[in-house]
Amino acid sequence: TTELTEEKYEYKEGQTLEVKCDYTLEKFASSQKAWQKMEGKMPKILAKTERPSENSHPVQVGRITLEDYHDHGLLQVQMTNLQVEDSGLYQCVIYQHPKESHVLFNPICLVVTKGSSGTPGSSENSTQNVYRTPSTTAKALGPRYTSPRTVTQAPPESTVVVSTPGSEINLTNVTDIIREQKLISEEDLEQKLISEEDLHHHHHH
């Protein structure tokens, strides 16, 4: 059985988290997408794109900016001026309903600490890029930063569909909760998802 494991990313206060969510499939291009934090029984939607999602149109909610690039199947998420209280588990999803969102990659366990950064090439206001590839493997990918650019072996590209668990989540039981999540194959998803074009007859091409 495939398991999803969270990946831990450590930042200092004031830094910027930049996540590239890779959704690959054209049918998801105009789907509404969301950046959510796992809090309690339901994920908390922090920001979501328009419905249908507009190409290259930034959506800003407080310190969070989402920008969807249909032509390359990438959603950029930025969280600026990170604070200690931002620590937690985050997911980038194809947003349908809080109880059943379609996760695009293994969740991110964000840990924000006080104090100046001791990592090379970073500062209080620096940005670290996290590259997210759809994953059906349990092995977590480490972060890829723009400088230095590292060579990684990414898992096969395919979209993972997850039904959000209905239990309390904290940073100590995250892995166990994720292991209980239900995975659906891409082919099942084909039958399950009502395509955006049928709902909206709206295209951006």
Epitope: T24, V151, E190, S195
Partner: antibody
Framework: EVQLVESGGGLVQPGGSLKLSCAAS????????MHWVRQASGKGLEWVGR??????????YYAASVKGRFTISRDDSKNTAYLQMNSLKTEDTAVYYC????????????WGQGTLVTVSS | DIVLTQSPDSLAVSLGERATINCRAS??????????LHWYQQKPGQPPKLLIY???NLESGVPDRFSGSGSGTDFTLTISSLQAEDVAVYYC?????????FGQGTKLEIK
Amino acid sequence: EVQLVESGGGLVQPGGSLKLSCAASGFTFSTYAMHWVRQASGKGLEWVGRIRTKSSNYATYYAASVKGRFTISRDDSKNTAYLQMNSLKTEDTAVYYCTRDMGIRRQFAYWGQGTLVTVSS
Amino acid sequence: DIVLTQSPDSLAVSLGERATINCRASESVDTFDYSFLHWYQQKPGQPPKLLIYRASNLESGVPDRFSGSGSGTDFTLTISSLQAEDVAVYYCQQSNEDPYTFGQGTKLEIK
């Protein structure tokens, strides 16, 4: 298992037409863009063009060398992509491969075995 | 159109030695710091086989002696320890912009 099988190749005179087919199986055909790539004998690979999915209005894109002469289409109900080649030239002689990418602007993970098109008088 | 230029055109390397193939793009093939540059191997009479995707990601089932690196306009395919079965023609390909384009190919032989 993903399979792509090209057919329709053969000998045709310059100025003639030919329609190639690519029968796909082992995956949800309608989800992916399909591409054609060709290779003249002893030469390198040349991307011919691609057709996107229904959610992208079946948009097509072509290499400059074939634009206006070649047309890519698809029939999702038949899991088949097509390459209609008109006004053929001797330099179009090549093995034509059908390929499937891994998503939007992604790599070609699956290839057919190719079908040979010979344009000669 | 983005032109991909591979170097060298041909390469002879001893078994067990390192082989390096370069690919230079006429303009950046990056979007969002993702490099839409891929590497393929082709043996005579066969269709190409994907080795590396998006510059540095090893395709499933490909031996880990193959690796890719680079970003922007300059990319490298490395075979850390050449095996007899690696004799082939290698191509880079970009998918960042239409039309997609391939490099001219590099023929790798055993010295």
